[in-house]
């Protein structure tokens, strides 16, 4: 990880843009910790493995989280 320091948040910018759940490879929700005082959401896209930081406060991102958790609950027995 570049620019590594003991206390550092990963997200430099956060995106409000809607993300198509089908284009997602992985969605990481990193809780607040001693390293970063806020929740961070990092989406890994299928296209070229691009990683994008998402705004947890954005309506579009909240909808994405709902859609992903709904999809997960469908899959789990």
């Amino acid at each position: 990880v570049p620019l590594s320091r003991t206390v550092r948040c990963t997200c430099i910018s956060i995106s409000n843009q809607p993300v198509n759940p089908r284009s997602l490879e992985k969605l990481e929700i990193i809780p607040a910790s001693q390293f970063c005082p806020r929740v961070e959401i990092i989406a890994t896209m299928k296209k070229k493995g691009e990683k994008r930081c998402l705004n947890p406060e954005s309506k579009a991102i909240k909808n994405l989280l709902k859609a992903v958790s709904k999809e997960r609950s469908k899959r789990s027995p």
């Epitope: 320091r5 948040c9 430099i12 910018s13 956060i14 995106s15 409000n16």
Partner: antibody, heavy 124, light 107 residues
Framework: QVQLVESGGGVVQPGRSLRLSCTAS????????MHWVRQAPGKGLEWVAI????????DYAASVKGRFTISRDNSKNTLYLQMNSLRAEDTAVYYC?????????????????WGQGTTVTVSS | EVVLTQSPGTLSLSPGERATLSCRAS???????LAWYQQKPGQAPRLLIY???SRATGIPDRFSGSGSGTDFTLTISRLEPEDFAVYYC????????FGGGTKVEIK
């Protein structure tokens, strides 16, 4: 439209201070990391400093560390560069630039919007 | 710090020709951390490529980026008159640094 406008440049004596400002419009300033980049006359680009979208972290080029401070006021859509103990080699055009949407320490989207620059001349 | 060396320093070509610009890093960097910019005299730089190979919004498809590790390339497939400018590579694998630039001039 999306725009960055720098101000505050001028002629200053060695050892003195100067504060640059960069005013953003046309986008949600509070969700983007921001940079300062400079270009000495007839030379290439030199990265100066970065600040995270919420001001939680900063980083500096070795050449300015301890002398320059980057800060932001998200309520005013404004980025700042406080420059102390100025030297002749700090003479340059200073640009503010926006970090790409969703950039992180794991993936970099480049500096996608730039201001027109403000000129700083350090001379006695 | 990661040092980026661009070559050649100057490239003299005619409109319609192919331009190949090189950027070499002093240590290996992830392709996700490399960008290319174009700068014309008296203007601010413009982002062309991020993530070593992804075109920025509004950039024509004659511009393409490739490479990994320590060697990266910007290719302009057919030079248009407006493409004559200085090109910089930039990395963010550690504190950001720019290469020294390649000037593409009209032959």
């Amino acid at each position: 439209q999306v725009q960055l406008v720098e101000s505050g440049g001028g002629v200053v004596q060695p050892g003195r201070s100067l504060r640059l400002s960069c005013t953003a419009s046309g986008f949600t300033f509070s969700t983007y990391g921001m940079h300062w980049v400079r270009q000495a006359p007839g030379k290439g680009l030199e990265w100066v400093a970065i600040i995270w979208f919420d001001g939680s972290n900063e980083d500096y080029a070795a050449s300015v560390k301890g002398r320059f401070t980057i800060s932001r006021d998200n309520s005013k859509n404004t980025l700042y560069l406080q420059m102390n103990s100025l030297r002749a080699e700090d003479t340059a055009v200073y640009y503010c630039a926006r970090e790409g949407d969703g950039s992180s320490l794991y993936y970099y989207y480049g500096m996608d919007v730039w201001g027109q620059g403000t000129t700083v001349t350090v001379s006695s | 710090e990661v040092v980026l060396t661009q070559s050649p320093g100057t490239l003299s070509l005619s409109p319609g020709e192919r331009a190949t610009l090189s950027c070499r890093a002093s240590q290996s960097i992830s392709s996700g951390y490399l960008a290319w910019y174009q700068q014309k005299p008296g203007q601010a730089p413009r982002l062309l490529i991020y993530g070593a190979s992804s075109r920025a919004t509004g950039i024509p498809d004659r511009f393409s980026g490739s490479g990994s590790g320590t060697d990266f390339t910007l290719t302009i497939s057919r030079l248009e008159p407006e493409d004559f400018a200085v090109y910089y590579c930039q990395q963010y694998g550690s504190s950001p640094t720019f290469g020294g630039g390649t000037k593409v001039e009209i032959k």
